[in-house]
Amino acid sequence: PEPPTACREKQYLINSQCCSLCQPGQKLVSDCTEFTETECLPCGESEFLDTWNRETHCHQHKYCDPNLGLRVQQKGTSETDTICTCEEGWHCTSEACESCVLHRSCSPGFGVKQIATGVSDTICEPCPVGFFSNVSSAFEKCHPWTSCETKDLVVQQAGTNKTDVVCGPQDRLRA
């Protein structure tokens, strides 16, 4: 028979022979022959391969370096890499999460629209009319101005995006 030029899924072509790929979590030791199946070996401790493959070396699990603010979110297996995330108050600088930076705080006049996670930074928004923030914070949203009316008070000083209104007593009309 003619030697194959293409192989089935989960196979590879080597020296005119279709050989089975190694399953995830295993590496290639020896190609198949007409008489012998592909020889694969499980990845060692702290190694992985996440696809059907013909790799002769497994990949090392990612190291979550605490000196870079990283910690393990999900421990790696022979088939998956370790997933790192950042310590509380920090977030990843990239999708690969190779290092962390401190969460950004929202300055006065801005409030937190979305609290930061281990993988995304704080999202701030300007406080709209009727709201204010007088602190630099990674958690505080814009607060609504105090409603003087509901306290039977009147506005003595108008609010801004950084300050609340100042309420005061109503002037009593003299008879």
């Epitope: 020296n15 020896s30 190609d31 198949c32 022959t33 007409e34 008489f35 012998t36 199946e37 020889e39």
Partner: antibody
Framework: QVQLVESGGGVVQPGRSLRLSCAAS????????MHWVRQAPGKCLEWVAV????????YYADSVKGRFTISRDNSKNTLYLQMNSLRAEDTAVYYC??????????WGQGTMVTVSS | EIVLTQSPGTLSLSPGERATLSCRAS???????LAWYQQKPGQAPRLLIY???ARANGIPDRFSGSGSGTDFTLTISRLEPEDFAVYYC??????????FGCGTKVEIK
């Protein structure tokens, strides 16, 4: 450890039969092709036969074709060589060896077959 | 059938010397599927080199293989006392039959 151990050799008269066995241990026997190779006293190595991992494919040297049969029992991790119509020129040490894309990487210690009247 | 011719038949050398063994094929050996084996008296052959130039597991680096097509060489850079033995080449590309050369004996001078 990975090991192959042959047995069944001995002295036999011409025209008679003998069955050699090769017991495998330390590896997944059912994933490997297996060979028989022989060596007449003071002579070169001569390939005899091969069988595929599941026992479907078998090839023989012309010198033994029609007289020798290679077989295997994966449940017993054992390879066999049935030798019929033996001749004086079949006198040799018979080795079993493991098939890989790297050649014959593991060999047994051999078993001696003497064909003599 | 691929016929393998090994030369010389015998090589007489002293420990520490370099040994060069030749294996010539009657036709090209596909994919360089050529192996070298070492055999000592009363023992089974041991795989040294496969794919013409790759050392098998546990084989010291003084053993090296080279060549392709029809001409192959096994070199032992500095002979140790335990290296005196018979060396066989074998092709496993074109079968049946898998063929062996008739060996080169490396003996102490």
């Amino acid at each position: 450890q990975v090991q192959l151990v042959e047995s069944g050799g001995g002295v036999v008269q011409p025209g008679r039969s003998l069955r050699l066995s090769c017991a495998a241990s330390g590896f997944t026997f059912g994933s490997y092709g297996m060979h028989w190779v022989r060596q007449a006293p003071g002579k070169c190595l001569e390939w005899v036969a091969v069988i595929s991992y599941e026992g479907v494919k078998k090839y023989y040297a012309d010198s033994v074709k029609g007289r020798f049969t290679i077989s295997r029992d994966n449940s017993k991790n054992t390879l066999y060589l049935q030798m019929n119509s033996l001749r004086a020129e079949d006198t040799a040490v018979y080795y079993c060896a493991r098939d890989t894309s790297r050649g014959h990487d593991i060999w047994g210690q051999g078993t001696m077959v003497t064909v003599s009247s | 059938e691929i016929v393998l011719t090994q030369s010389p038949g015998t090589l007489s050398l002293s420990p520490g010397e370099r040994a060069t063994l030749s294996c010539r094929a009657s036709q090209s050996v596909s994919y360089d599927y050529l192996a070298w084996y070492q055999q000592k008296p009363g023992q089974a052959p041991r795989l040294l080199i496969y794919g013409a130039s790759a050392r098998a597991n546990g084989i010291p680096d003084r053993f090296s293989g080279s060549g392709s097509g029809t001409d192959f060489t096994l070199t032992i850079s500095r002979l140790e006392p335990e290296d005196f033995a018979v060396y066989y080449c074998q092709q496993y590309a074109d079968y049946p039959p898998f063929t062996f050369g008739c060996g080169t004996k490396v003996e102490i001078k």
